[in-house]
């Protein structure tokens, strides 16, 4: 049979099962891609959007690796990547995505590796990805690259439906904490890259989750803004005993100023000012507990005093009752006088 034609602006190799359409100013995916293509590079173009049907079988039944990086893509629409039965690797990096449809891959995709480096800078794209992942459309995903996206927080539950995930790259973002991130479902996770973020401390909840992941062997935490106060004590203890953290010897304090540059592994509890008020939420919590105990003690003492003086109190109560009765009788008499018209003059002229 004659060799399949190569789309005009592209370069093709049947021997390499590859088509490259690189920096060709394309505004759409070429419709006449050869059926042998396993590796498709459409990069550095001006696609703008990826509509449903732009890439579809049966012509692309063999397509396993798709690189769509740097194409000025703003939208990946519902069904755009749904009809690719062999797709295992997708790179959407360097696109200013505003919309990533939760139905972009259809109901289920064989995709194993997804790169979104620098493509989730807009909230719409991040939320779309979160919905897409939570819907379970990418349950076969083993590698997820979310680096260089300026992320402050991950949407809650975003990583909950990724049972096959082995490698997660969150480097070069602005993550300030991991409190709302659940790692528990990532039972196959082997490597986690959190370098170049704004993490100040790792809390016990996160550390406990990591301890519970049997395959997790490589955690990268370099170049974060570690705050070396009392709250970091548990993290330092974990670091000292963990063999999961790459280059842990190089991790150092960023704050407070007097601790800047100090190696985390060389910190002592005495240096961490655990008596000083540092972590406001936990200090408040401690204060409330203490206040509760004090109030309970006062209440108990009060009840004890009442019990010990029960006879005196009973006598005192009787006295009060008698006094009240006398007082009320006076009111009662006065009311009767006021009610009788014959006694009106008397009441107005007397001090009853």
């Amino acid at each position: 049979q004659p060799p399949a034609a190569c789309p005009a602006p592209c370069e093709c190799s049947e021997a390499a099962k590859t088509v490259k359409c690189v920096n060709k100013n394309l505004t759409e995916v070429p419709p006449d891609l050869p059926p042998y293509v396993r590796n498709l590079f459409i990069t550095g173009n001006r696609l703008g959007r990826l509509p449903a049907g732009a890439l579809s079988a049966p012509r692309l039944a063999e397509l396993g690796s798709l690189n769509l990086s740097g194409n000025h893509l703003r939208a990946v629409e519902a069904g755009a990547l749904a009809a690719l039965p062999a797709l295992r690797q997708l790179d959407l990096g360097g696109n200013p995505l505003a919309e990533l449809s939760p139905l972009a891959f259809g109901r289920a995709s064989p995709l194993e590796e997804l790169a979104l480096r620098g493509a989730l800078r807009e909230q719409g794209a991040l939320l779309g990805l979160a919905d897409l992942l939570q819907a379970g459309a990418l349950r076969n995903l083993s590698r997820l690259e979310l680096a260089d996206n300026g992320l402050l927080l991950l949407p809650t539950g975003m990583l909950g439906a990724l049972p096959a995930l082995r490698h997660l790259d969150l480097s070069n973002n602005s993550l300030v904490g991991l409190r709302n991130v659940s790692f528990q479902g990532l039972v196959r996770l082997q490597s986690l890259n959190l370098s170049d973020n704004s993490l100040g401390v790792l809390r016990n909840g996160t550390l406990a989750q990591w301890r519970g992941l049997p395959a997790l062997r490589r955690i990268s935490l370099s170049h974060n803004t570690w705050v070396c106060d009392c709250a970091i004590e548990d993290m330092v203890a974990w670091l000292k005993e963990s063999d999961q953290v790459e280059g842990k010897e190089a991790l150092s304090c960023a704050f407070p100023e007097k601790m800047a540059g100090r190696a985390l592994l060389k910190l002592n509890t005495s240096e961490l000012n655990c008596s000083a008020p540092v972590d406001v939420p936990s200090q408040l919590q401690t204060s409330y507990v203490f206040l509760g105990i004090v109030l309970a003690l006062i209440g108990a003492i009060f009840l004890l005093v009442l019990y010990l003086n029960r006879k005196g109190i009973k006598k005192w109560m009787h006295n009060i009752r008698d006094a009240c009765r006398d007082h009320m009788e006076g009111y009662h008499y006065r009311y009767e006088i006021n009610a009788d018209p014959r006694l009106t003059n008397l009441s107005s002229n007397s001090d009853v």
Partner: antibody, heavy 122, light 107 residues
Framework: QVQLQQWGAGLLKPSETLSLTCAVY????????WSWIRQPPGKGLEWIGE???????NYNPSLKSRVTISVDTSKNQFSLKLSSVTAADTAVYYC????????????????WGQGTTVTVSS | EIVLTQSPATLSLSPGERATLSCRAS??????LAWYQQKPGQAPRLLIY???NRATGIPARFSGSGSGTDFTLTISSLEPEDFAVYYC?????????FGQGTRLEIK
């Protein structure tokens, strides 16, 4: 990471059939092309042919009439048969795996067997 | 078939020097070209794929460039372990072909 281990007869007489097998460890068969390359003593590398996981083959035209490459996915093995050998077929024979999809992976013959020296002599 | 011609056949340099190896194709291979290093008694080792991409674990002193018919492998500062034979290989068309090799030896 995929590793390859190869074996087969090292000494042949002219007109016999060279038979080599390569076992694949630590990886899946899909996505890869399984190749055979040879290197005569003191010379350069010569591509013999390749097969993919579906059994589709491509051969060097200079050897095509004598070469058969087959795959046994159940055993994770692929084999080379070269018929009617002569002294010119004396070489180190390598099996190699080329990963046919790009990502963090290589784009060439990225994993090689240890090589089997085959000598054809009467 | 596509013929790859490597030059020079032998290159004599000292450690620390810069090495430039050339590979020319008889017709365009786009960027479907790889470079391999082979030491005596060993299998070849992939250095560069797709003309300019370094394979995993390859030091930064190795770089590849070129497209179409002319390709270059550059070793910025030679280390003692770099002295070996270097081959280019094209995967643009069947049959896949290798260059005849450039021997890099210590001066």
């Amino acid at each position: 990471q995929v590793q390859l281990q190869q074996w087969g007869a090292g000494l042949l007489k002219p007109s016999e059939t060279l038979s080599l097998t390569c076992a694949v460890y630590g990886g899946s068969f899909s996505g890869y092309y399984w190749s055979w390359i040879r290197q005569p003593p003191g010379k350069g590398l010569e591509w013999i042919g390749e097969i993919d996981h579906s059994g589709s083959t491509n051969y060097n035209p200079s050897l095509k009439s004598r070469v058969t490459i087959s795959v046994d996915t159940s055993k994770n093995q692929f084999s080379l048969k070269l018929s009617s050998v002569t002294a010119a077929d004396t070489a180190v024979y390598y099996c190699a795996a080329w990963f046919g999809e790009l990502w963090d992976y290589y784009y060439g013959m990225d994993v090689w067997g240890q090589g089997t020296t085959v000598t054809v002599s009467s | 078939e596509i013929v790859l011609t490597q030059s020079p056949a032998t290159l004599s340099l000292s450690p620390g020097e810069r090495a430039t190896l050339s590979c020319r194709a008889s017709q365009s291979v786009s960027s479907f070209l790889a470079w391999y290093q082979q030491k005596p008694g060993q299998a070849p080792r992939l250095l560069i794929y797709d003309a300019s991409n370094r394979a995993t674990g390859i030091p930064a002193r190795f770089s590849g460039s070129g497209s179409g018919t002319d390709f270059t492998l550059t070793i910025s500062s030679l280390e003692p372990e770099d002295f070996a034979v270097y081959y280019c290989q094209q995967r643009s068309n069947w049959p896949l072909t290798f260059g005849q090799g450039t021997r890099l030896e210590i001066k």
